[in-house]
């Protein structure tokens, strides 16, 4: 999916109002400096691409974050504010239902969510120096 035509300000508002807090809750008890940066993004569409990948694609050591509160709210925000996003996710969602597993918070998941926090921060506060 190409995130170029999303309403970035509305997604930013959703992040600030709820998603950021859910990420903090998930990470509670973990130091912010515990994990090295392993993913980045260079513009807002790129940030959303990486956020979607880390949030919804299973990885080794972290089978699924998709049922977490922050993930469901991320999905809702993208569905509402990115034209045509919902349609692209129907097949992916059906595949997810077949793979549903018990939720387990592993260290790998904590690391992954730490990376997500970094991506969201970059999306929210683009790296341009205020002149």
């Amino acid at each position: 999916y190409d995130f170029t035509n999303c309403d970035f300000e509305k997604i930013k508002a959703a992040y600030l109002s709820t998603i950021s807090k859910d990420l903090i809750t998930y990470m509670s008890g973990t130091k912010s400096t515990e994990f090295n940066n392993t993913v980045s993004c260079s513009n807002r569409p790129h940030c959303l691409t990486e956020i979607q990948s880390l949030t919804f694609n299973p990885t080794a050591g972290c089978a699924s974050l998709a049922k977490e509160m922050f993930a469901m709210k991320t999905k809702a925000a993208l569905a509402i504010w990115c034209p045509g996003y919902s349609e692209t996710q129907i097949n992916a969602t059906q595949a997810m239902k077949k793979r549903r597993k018990r939720k387990v918070t592993t260290n790998k998941c904590l690391e992954q969510v730490s990376q997500l926090q970094g991506l969201w921060r970059r999306f929210n506060r683009p790296l341009l120096k205020q002149q």
Partner: antibody, heavy 126, light 106 residues
Framework: QVQLVESGGGVVQPGRSLRLSCAAS????????IHWVRQAPGKGLEWVAV????????YYADSVKGRFTISRDNSKNTLYLQMNSLRAEDTAVYYC???????????????????WGQGTTVTVSS | SYELTQAPSVSVSPGQTASITCSGD??????ACWYQQKPGQSPVLVIY???KRPSGIPERFSGSNSGNTATLTISGTQAMDEADYYC?????????FGGGTKLTVL
Amino acid sequence: QVQLVESGGGVVQPGRSLRLSCAASGFIFSSYGIHWVRQAPGKGLEWVAVISYDGSYKYYADSVKGRFTISRDNSKNTLYLQMNSLRAEDTAVYYCARGDSWNDRLNYYFYDMDVWGQGTTVTVSS
Amino acid sequence: SYELTQAPSVSVSPGQTASITCSGDKLGDKYACWYQQKPGQSPVLVIYQDKKRPSGIPERFSGSNSGNTATLTISGTQAMDEADYYCQAWDSSTVVFGGGTKLTVL
């Protein structure tokens, strides 16, 4: 762990070509811009080139423009530097470095380099 | 083309504060960062976005950037801080490094 490893250096005659490689591991290579930086013996750091995360933007130092080409293969987590028409003044240790960047609709900005390789030595001599 | 100017060398006694400066036209309008390089080793990022410290860099390293000058400050300098220090910024499609400052801890 997060790592960059350069290879391909060696001794080459003036006017000849050489291709350097930089293998990345421990991070999502395809999400970062990557630089080549060199350091001549006893001298300071000199930036050579940078490529954006998806390869769509490439920038070069004036001293290598038209002679060097930066490229990447995200499927192989590898960065390359094709060096043609080499000169004695290209003799240096060549480092690849992971870069921070941002682009708006008008410009690309590259900032700091937070992970560096160990370097590979290129000697141009007859 | 854009240039960043650093003093070739700075000396400091152990425990004292070392200040290394980097000057360039309207440098304060850009993000500056600093690298430490010890002999035979690769550079290490010690300050980014003017004043932020990467994880693992001691608190004694700090940075500032305004006007035409960026400054790297090392408070309570230790012998292990002896190294070359380079400033760096981005200007119109080019990465620019300063010439480097050799910090000697007397």
